[in-house]
């Protein structure tokens, strides 16, 4: 029979993607770098179905995703179009709130305790989720 590609150990398969869920917290940039070293990226949510899957695995815990507006417009880390894509913001969000007293606004998106999205200060140490395409998961990494 044909060989079936599998996700790496400790990664969870769903709809032709592999996901890894952290148990500790990092700032968004450090979480982003962690996923890049895995030859993966912070999770990019493209459907309600994927939203429910991720939400089920992370529980009611603030968790970074691969969405930010650090350079102006909101962008997904894998280039998925933000404007036409799936969104699940909390009411009144994103608000780029400056009242937190940490300097600057809020440029990184995370899942909140109910799964809906909020923008927050990128330096906060939240959990994170890495994602990679299943076909890519079994391939050798690119030469860097």
């Amino acid at each position: 029979g044909s060989e079936r590609t599998c996700c790496p150990v400790n990664w969870v398969e769903h709809e032709r993607s592999c996901y890894w869920f952290s148990r500790s917290g990092k700032a968004w940039a450090d979480a982003d770098n962690y996923c890049r070293l895995e030859d993966a990226h912070l999770v990019v949510v493209t459907s309600w179905e994927e939203q429910k899957f991720v939400q089920h695995h992370i529980g009611p815990v603030n968790t970074w995703m691969g969405l930010h507006d650090q350079n102006g417009p909101w962008k997904w880390v894998d280039g998925t179009d933000y404007e036409t894509g799936f969104k699940n913001w909390r009411p009144e969000q994103p608000d780029d709130w400056y009242g937190h007293g940490l300097g600057g606004g809020e440029d990184c998106a995370h899942f909140t305790d109910d799964g809906r999205w909020n923008d927050d200060v990128c330096q906060r140490p939240y959990r994170w989720v890495c994602e990679t395409e299943l076909d890519k998961a079994s391939q050798e990494p690119p030469l860097l």
Partner: antibody, heavy 123, light 107 residues
Framework: EVQLLDSGGGLGQPGGSLRLSCAAS????????MNWVRQAPGKGLEWVST????????YYADSVKGRFTISRDNSKNTLYLQMNSLRAEDTAVYYC????????????????WGQGTLVTVSS | EIVLTQFPDSQSVTPKEKVTITCRAS??????LHWYQQKPEQSPKVLIK???QSFSGVPSRFSGSGSGTDFTLTINSLEAEDAATYYC?????????FGQGTKVEIK
């Protein structure tokens, strides 16, 4: 207290094998990539290999590619370096080192490098 | 491969003097440049990470600056215990590389 404890060094024969270990404690091991760095006697530091946090991806210096294998057991909080086809030029102190985060705020006394383990390759 | 070149190779300095060590990268590495101190028979210690981030517990006389290709480690008011070899290291891309080291001796 955060610690990295290197072990497994010793005398290896040219063409032979050794396996180094690095036992980690005091931090969430699978949340960090890990590295091996070596230092030949009287020389500078040389990066050897890096493994991603989950172990999914590995990276090697050209000088050890195809001979050395980095791996990790996250259930045991341990990093490994399997050294095969040893050469005289592999003689060095080998250090394991934790990947540094930009925003990490480790407490005082934290040392992201092991104490080193000496590998001597000689017949 | 990104080559890191340190200046000077060695330096003999009087206590309380200011020491400046530079590290030049052969291509842009952003802020992914780290500084280590190594004393004889000891493992390297992190001084500065990501060009300018002071590492926990490191004396305030050590500071780092720069981005892109040019970086500087500064030791304000050198102390006798600072006699060591200092290395820069880039984590921007693989293969990761180190500078050749700068040996600081006390006069």
């Amino acid at each position: 207290e955060v610690q990295l404890l290197d072990s497994g060094g010793g005398l290896g024969q040219p063409g032979g094998s050794l396996r180094l270990s690095c036992a980690a404690s005091g931090f969430t091991f699978d949340s960090y990539a890990m590295n091996w760095v070596r230092q030949a006697p009287g020389k500078g530091l040389e990066w050897v290999s890096t493994i991603s946090g989950t172990g999914r991806r590995t990276y090697y210096a050209d000088s050890v590619k195809g001979r050395f294998t980095i791996s990790r057991d996250n259930s045991k909080n341990t990093l490994y370096l399997q050294m095969n086809s040893l050469r005289a030029e592999d003689t060095a102190v080998y250090y394991c080192a934790k990947e540094e985060d930009y925003y990490d705020s480790s407490g005082p006394g934290f040392d992201p490098w092991g104490q080193g383990t000496l590998v001597t390759v000689s017949s | 491969e990104i080559v890191l070149t340190q200046f000077p190779d060695s330096q003999s300095v009087t206590p309380k003097e200011k020491v400046t060590i530079t590290c030049r990268a052969s291509q842009n590495i952003g802020s992914s440049l780290h500084w280590y101190q190594q004393k004889p028979e000891q493992s390297p210690k992190v001084l500065i990470k990501y060009a300018s981030q002071s590492f926990s517990g490191v004396p305030s006389r050590f500071s780092g600056s720069g981005s892109g290709t040019d970086f500087t480690l500064t030791i304000n008011s050198l102390e006798a215990e600072d006699a060591a070899t200092y290395y820069c290291h880039q984590s921007s891309s693989f293969p990761r590389t180190f500078g050749q080291g700068t040996k600081v001796e006390i006069k």
